[in-house]
Interface confidence: low
């Protein structure tokens, strides 16, 4: 709306940078063959690039990434008892970001 | 996998709390009748609840929200020239979060 501008602060662009995001740990990251288990924790924090660039032809992308292995619990039910095991999930953290030109492929004629 | 756990730190749950997220300001928030304009900035930061709760029957939800009006630029093209106008967009910030029981409606029999 164009009205009620008095109390409104100027909007500030969300710059292209790393921010903390929540990554859901899906069970098939751990075991694709078996569904009879739970994962703990179900989600973790990761660093990801987000935000906007100066025009629509550029996008905020990671310029440097780091793989980070973490240990999660795989909770299986064996003979009606919970059995706590461990598994490794490799997370991707973004360390640096940049506004990168989006190259849209030309349609083949 | 059971191997290569040595270098893996235990995963820490992404707790239910407010985090900074990027909100894309879509043009139809400003003018649904006209597509011949740009918005600046195209995105802003907002505070939103995210993270996991202790079990699947509870979800991370906002327990307190605040509406925040911000001023954006509406850049119209009039006779091939940019015309700068102002508009207000109301953003929703989450101030506090809680793990809330998800009530799934019983199927009607």
């Amino acid at each position: 709306s164009l009205g009620s501008l008095a109390a409104a602060e100027p909007a500030v662009i969300a710059e292209c940078k790393t921010r903390t995001e929540v990554f859901q740990i899906s069970r098939n990251l751990i075991d694709r063959t078996n569904a009879n288990f739970l994962v703990w924790p179900p989600c973790v924090e990761v660093q990801r690039c987000s935000g906007c660039c100066n025009n629509r032809n550029v996008q905020c992308r990671a310029s440097q990434v780091q793989m980070r292995p973490v240990q999660v619990r795989k909770i299986e039910i064996v003979r009606k008892k919970p059995v706590f095991k461990k598994a490794t999930v490799t997370l991707e953290d973004h360390l640096a970001c940049k506004c990168e030109t989006v190259v849209t492929p030309r349609p083949v004629t | 996998s059971l191997g290569s756990l040595a270098a893996a730190e235990p995963a820490v749950i992404a707790e239910c709390k407010t985090r900074t997220e990027v909100f894309q300001i879509s043009r139809n928030l400003i003018d649904r009748t006209n597509a011949n304009f740009l918005v600046w900035p195209p995105c802003v930061e907002v505070q939103r609840c995210s993270g996991c709760c202790n079990n699947r029957n509870v979800q991370c939800r906002a327990s307190q929200v605040q509406m925040r009006p911000v001023q954006v630029r509406k850049i119209e093209i009039v006779r091939k020239k940019p015309v700068f106008k102002k508009a207000t967009v109301t953003l929703e910030d989450h101030l506090a979060c809680k793990c809330e029981t998800v009530v799934t409606p019983r199927p009607v029999t």
Partner: antibody, heavy 120, light 107 residues
């Protein structure tokens, strides 16, 4: 460097009680499951009890169930074993162990142990 | 409860010998089998976890194999510092159980 130091052992009469402590250092204690394992003189290893990182999950050997209680204080980096109704067959060296490996039920670092002697 | 049976209970060997110790579980434990070394008056030391994974810092002459119910610890070339007692342990389910131990002595 991971260090686990047990204390609290000693001579106790049958039916008596003791509380063992295990002071941990050199790792993030609150992130790891911990266990007690015992070894009677000249005998093999016997698992006693395990506690989860947050303390919410505990397991006990049948031989000590109902008599021993495992607990932890993450703010003090300390593991405990409260032993009640002690019997002669509980005589052993009690060691705490950290489970940082492939399952919560293996022991990759051990303390040197503290001797508990149950005798009249 | 899962019983772990180790054999032999003791063996005599010379430096440089290849030594094999076996461990049998009373039911399948997948690959949740660990091997420990204990020297007199010392705390046990983890050698192998998950049946075949070498613990960090353990010499490569130690290796483990097997899955299900039958497992083997092999020392490819026995060294003077390897004379000790070796224990297997299942980490599949509580109650956690150890084998009775195998004492490796100097011939």
């Amino acid at each position: 460097e991971v260090q686990l130091v047990e204390s609290g052992g000693g001579l106790v009469q049958p039916g008596g009680s003791l509380r063992l402590s295990c002071a941990a250092s050199g790792f993030t204690f609150s992130s790891y499951w911990m266990s007690w394992v015992r070894q009677a003189p000249g005998k093999g290893l016997e698992w006693v009890s395990t506690i989860s990182d947050g303390g919410g999950t505990t397991s006990y050997a049948d031989s000590v169930k109902g008599r021993f209680t495992i607990s932890r204080d993450n703010s003090k980096n300390t593991l405990y074993l409260q032993m009640n109704s002690l019997r002669a067959e509980d005589t052993a060296v009690y060691s705490c162990a950290e489970s940082g490996g492939a399952t919560d039920y293996l022991f990759d670092y051990w303390g040197q142990g503290t001797l508990v002697t149950v005798s009249s | 409860d899962i019983q772990m049976t180790q054999s032999p209970s003791s063996l005599s060997a010379s430096v440089g010998d290849r030594v094999t110790i076996t461990c049998r579980a009373s039911q399948s434990i997948s690959s949740y089998l660990n091997w420990y070394q204990q020297k007199p008056g010392k705390a046990p030391k983890l050698l192998i976890y998950a049946a075949s994974s070498l613990q960090s810092g353990v010499p490569s002459r130690f290796s483990g194999s097997g899955s299900g119910t039958d497992f083997t610890l092999t020392i490819s070339s026995l060294q003077p510092e390897d004379f000790a007692t070796y224990y297997c342990q299942q980490s599949y389910i509580t109650p956690l159980t150890f084998g009775g131990g195998t004492k490796v002595e100097i011939k």
